[in-house]
């Protein structure tokens, strides 16, 4: 599936996301992870998802954003983190979204 550009795994019970996902799907532009059980994001989580334009993370249990998980997403247009457990609008330790 290396040519895949859109992946919808919404409404599952995914609690951990392996960073190698995007290494195996280098063309991925749209990733929908809504309504899963993710609790944390790190700067490794999407490090290899450099072509993403849309990332849907709404309705998870994300409470911890460690370091700068979106710093490599130079093409990101849509990021949805609604309905999570974030206590701050700070999405990491530096400005990441240009």
């Amino acid at each position: 599936y290396s040519q895949l550009t859109s992946l919808d795994v919404g409404f599952n019970t995914i609690s951990k996301l392996e960073p190698e996902l995007c290494q195996k799907l280098p063309m991925l532009k749209v990733l929908n992870l809504q309504h899963n059980e993710l609790s944390q994001l790190s700067d490794k989580t999407f490090a290899f998802c450099t072509n993403l334009t849309e990332l849907h993370l709404m309705s998870n249990s994300i409470q911890k954003i460690k370091n700068n998980p979106f710093v490599k997403q130079k093409n990101l247009i849509t990021l949805d983190l609604s309905h999570n457990g974030l206590s701050s609008t700070k999405l990491g330790t530096q400005v990441q979204l240009e």
């Epitope: 392996e18 960073p19 190698e20 290494q23 609790s39 944390q40 790190s42 490794k44 989580t45 490090a47 409470q63 911890k64 460690k66 206590s87």
Partner: antibody, heavy 117, light 107 residues
Framework: EVQLQQSGAELGKPGTSVKLSCKVS????????MHWVNQRPGKGLEWIGR????????IYGEDFKTKATLTADTSSNTAYMQLSQLKSDDTAIYFC??????????WGQGVMVTVSS | DIQMTQSPPSLSASLGETVSIECLAS??????LAWYQQRSGKSPQLLIY???RLQDGVPSRFSGSGSGTRYSLKISGMQPEDEADYFC?????????FGSGTKLEIK
């Protein structure tokens, strides 16, 4: 299956150095952080530091900034820790561990380092 | 550095009994807490992360709870294989720090 295989026990003389290795199978270390933790005889766990194998960036605990040097080789999927200027209180079991979020999902079996003249 | 004060240092429990271990952080750690089990002569094994999330493959008799500075690990129904040392660890801030451990023995 993810496995962390550490090198064998080390006997070092005071003032010398030892280099420990931790070979990871079943997971690419570029996708995580490699940590090192020690446990002195009969004692608890103490964090030494961690390395990001993707770029070599390291963070050390205060007591280990001049004691430990962490490196990683992504081509062999191996992390290393060098302990320098060995002293008797460096005698401990040293564990490598993997963790993307600074807790440790997987651990090596541990290696005993004994410092004695 | 964040100090992790773990109690009790040792604990004896009968098979089937429910036991709790506590960890108190010197400042708030926002649920960035993990619990490990270390059987004699073995490496530690992750039980709980993010204060209450059960690591894959860990029996459901283990549970974690807490918030702010105070956290606990509960074993609901002690089993022979639960005889081990238990450690908490904060991953909120560097340097990462561990509690001093609790030795759990079968009565």
């Amino acid at each position: 299956e993810v496995q962390l295989q550490q090198s064998g026990a080390e006997l070092g003389k005071p003032g010398t150095s030892v280099k420990l290795s931790c070979k990871v199978s079943g997971y690419n270390i570029r996708y995580t952080y490699m940590h090192w933790v020690n446990q002195r005889p009969g004692k608890g766990l103490e964090w030494i530091g961690r390395i990001d194998p993707a770029n070599g960036d390291s963070i050390y605990g205060e007591d280990f900034k001049t004691k430990a040097t962490l490196t990683a080789d992504t081509s062999s999927n191996t992390a290393y820790m060098q302990l320098s200027q060995l002293k008797s209180d460096d005698t401990a079991i040293y564990f490598c561990a993997m963790g993307e979020f600074d807790y440790f999902d997987y651990w090596g079996q541990g290696v005993m380092v004994t410092v004695s003249s | 550095d964040i100090q992790m004060t773990q109690s009790p240092p040792s604990l004896s429990a009968s098979l089937g009994e429910t036991v709790s271990i506590e960890c108190l952080a010197s400042e708030g750690i926002s649920n960035d807490l993990a619990w490990y089990q270390q059987r004699s002569g073995k490496s530690p094994q992750l039980l709980i992360y993010a204060a209450s999330r059960l690591q894959d493959g860990v029996p459901s008799r283990f549970s974690g709870s807490g918030s702010g500075t105070r956290y606990s690990l509960k074993i609901s129904g002690m089993q022979p294989e639960d005889e081990a040392d238990y450690f908490c660890q904060q991953n909120y801030k560097y340097p990462l720090t561990f509690g001093s451990g609790t030795k759990l023995e079968i009565k």
